[in-house]
Amino acid sequence: QSPIFGPQDVSSIEGNSVSITCYYPDTSVNRHTRKYWCRQGANGYCATLISSNGYLSKEYSGRASLINFPENSTFVINIAHLTQEDTGSYKCGLGTTNRGLFFDVSLEVSQVPEFPNDTHVYTKDIGRTVTIECRFKEGNAHSKKSLCKKRGEACEVVIDSTEYVDPSYKDRAILFMKGTSRDIFYVNISHLIPSDAGLYVCQAGEGPSADKNNADLQVLEPEPELLYKDLRSSVTFECDLGREVANDAKYLCRKNKETCDVIINTLGKRDPAFEGRILLTPRDDNGRFSVLITGLRKEDAGHYQCGAHSSGLPQEGWPVQAWQLFVNEESTIPNSRSVVKGVTGGSVAIVCPYNPKESSSLKYWCHWEADENGRCPVLVGTQALVQEGYEGRLALFDQPGSGAYTVILNQLTTQDSGFYWCLTDGDSRWRTTIELQVAEATKKPDLEVTPQNATAVIGETFTISCHYPCKFYSQEKYWCKWSNDGCHILPSHDEGARQSSVSCDQSSQIVSMTLNPVKKEDEGWYWCGVKEGQVYGETTAIYVAVEERTRGSPHINPTDANARAKDAPEEEAMESSVREDENKANLDPRLFADEREIQNAGDQAQENRASGNAGSAGGQSGSSK
């Protein structure tokens, strides 16, 4: 008695696919050991055709796969494009050899059935239209024409030329002649349903001189396409239902017992379980559309169907396409926070994982909008300008080699609440969904900038301070200048870091930045933030306005400014005296380079290492893109 279980007999027809599930006992060893599918030879030897170690035999090349589902203790063998040569005895099993634990499976592949010579076979999918062609001799040109369906010995009339239509074919069947043709009539049956399948007889005339034709109608249920996706990845259902339903509402539904529950349709219906992680996109004017679901969960596995009907709901006799989605829990996509919470006026740092093998891919962040089909306009990207309304408060920090990038959004308002997607132009499976929840702030923000009314005067020295609480004592503090392509880290000086680590005076933890001398191009948004290595934390933003010195205003020289800064105990401002260098050398030239060259993992890793020192106790500073 084998502990492995599966289907003992599998039967299909040529050209079809089979999906064979083998069940194994739920043990750690079984979950991780080799899985195989082999063909039993007459000599007792079982020749491996495919295994979970990556082996694929020549005869299965391009048409078979083996997928392990450890969380279900199953593995699935898919074989497509079956031929009669595939008929035989097989084993599905576990172990390093093909003699371990196994289960015997018999596969029988038959020819597509043939019919008598005078029978025309029509094969159509559910919901489609069939046109049955009926030939007759000239002698029956003016005789009654009819189509009937065989039920046992009887043949029940479906439609005839006297305008009779069987009630079950009402509004679906029409009998017509084309042009001047005197020897053929046609019967169209639309919105085909499974019970329409069977043998039909068309007839012109009565009695022994009647002309008869046999037609065998096969109505095919949609063969589900098998989709295997990792937990937390995304899936796209590509739906092509044909021109005849191009103008009807489209839907995607999930089969549940005898119903199919609509997940999304083009009339604005959407299942709350997919809120924030689904998009329906029309592909062309011929009725093609796709549905993308991100952040796949275990419970998303199941049978899906797309279709079209004016109601936006599944309707018998309308075309459908089917899929079976499997969700593999052994995912390469890391588990990241699905909900991020922030407060008004505060900030959030969202970590977006991406395929580490694609560090040069372009990264994006978009805001999912719940219009009728769902859409996700890009707010920021490695080569996309920050969207209007997000200037000065949104930036994307790439961290090449780490398999993640960070998006920071500050000056939060409750309108920022909603769903956001992390995506790249590379591996589409790595789309992740984050729900941002912004609540009203109940206390002062952790980071505060002084002066809050920041106006700098050209040619003078301008110092801006960022006060941080003791809880950020051990973290790196930085200042950066926001621009449309990121927030570039500036030299700054952290006062709190110079204190003894034994005590922490809540009132005197300051990181300051000095512009000396102020230039017109210094105008803009500046961020004060904290981070630990490549993990970004809280930020706050301030807009620094720059104005010409008005006549009569006192000129404060840099030393006075420094002296004034020194009046505040524990605070020692560090000026940007190497202003020319900073503006020229430290701005990343690749920001203006060709699109293909914009990402260079090596360089950027260097850059991030440099910025890691900004504001450290030794007074070192660095700048980064």
Epitope: P7, S11, P222, N256
Partner: nanobody, 126 residues
Framework: QVQLVESGGGLVQAGDSLRLSCAAS????????MGWFRQAPGKEREFVTT??????????YYADSVKGRFTISRDNAKNTVYLQMNSLKPDDTAVYYC?????????????????WGQGTQVTVSS
């Protein structure tokens, strides 16, 4: 809803054959698999055999205890599943239930089936 009606049970001698039928009506289009379970007095309901399908492909599953003796088949046009039982043994005595499922993860698990018939008694005397 799907309604299932079993027939063909009865009293037979050990070694004899019997053919059970299960006719499905209602929304049968949504079914994905149909099978047979049995329950002997004082015992748990036990998996016997199941047939699942996808288009023109059929998958037949059997319990070890009936392999080689029982055969499941279906007539698509009649929405009927048959269980041909050969070489019957006294151990096969039980009430045989027909079950249907819309989505099946493991055909051996009774809770995976959405619809059940009333059952038909099979008694095998020695």
């Amino acid at each position: 809803q799907v309604q299932l009606v079993e027939s063909g049970g009865g009293l037979v001698q050990a070694g004899d054959s019997l053919r059970l039928s299960c006719a499905a009506s209602g929304r049968t289009r949504t079914t994905y698999g149909m099978g047979w379970f049995r329950q002997a007095p004082g015992k748990e309901r036990e998996f016997v055999t199941t047939i699942t399908w996808s288009g023109s492909t059929n998958y037949k599953y059997y319990a070890d205890s009936v392999k080689g003796r029982f055969t499941i088949s279906r007539d698509n046009a009649k929405n009927t599943v048959y269980l041909q039982m050969n070489s019957l043994k006294p151990d096969d005595t039980a009430v045989y239930y027909c079950a249907a499922s819309t989505v099946l993860t493991d055909p051996r698990v009774p809770t995976e089936y959405d619809y059940w018939g009333q059952g038909t008694q099979v008694t095998v005397s020695s």
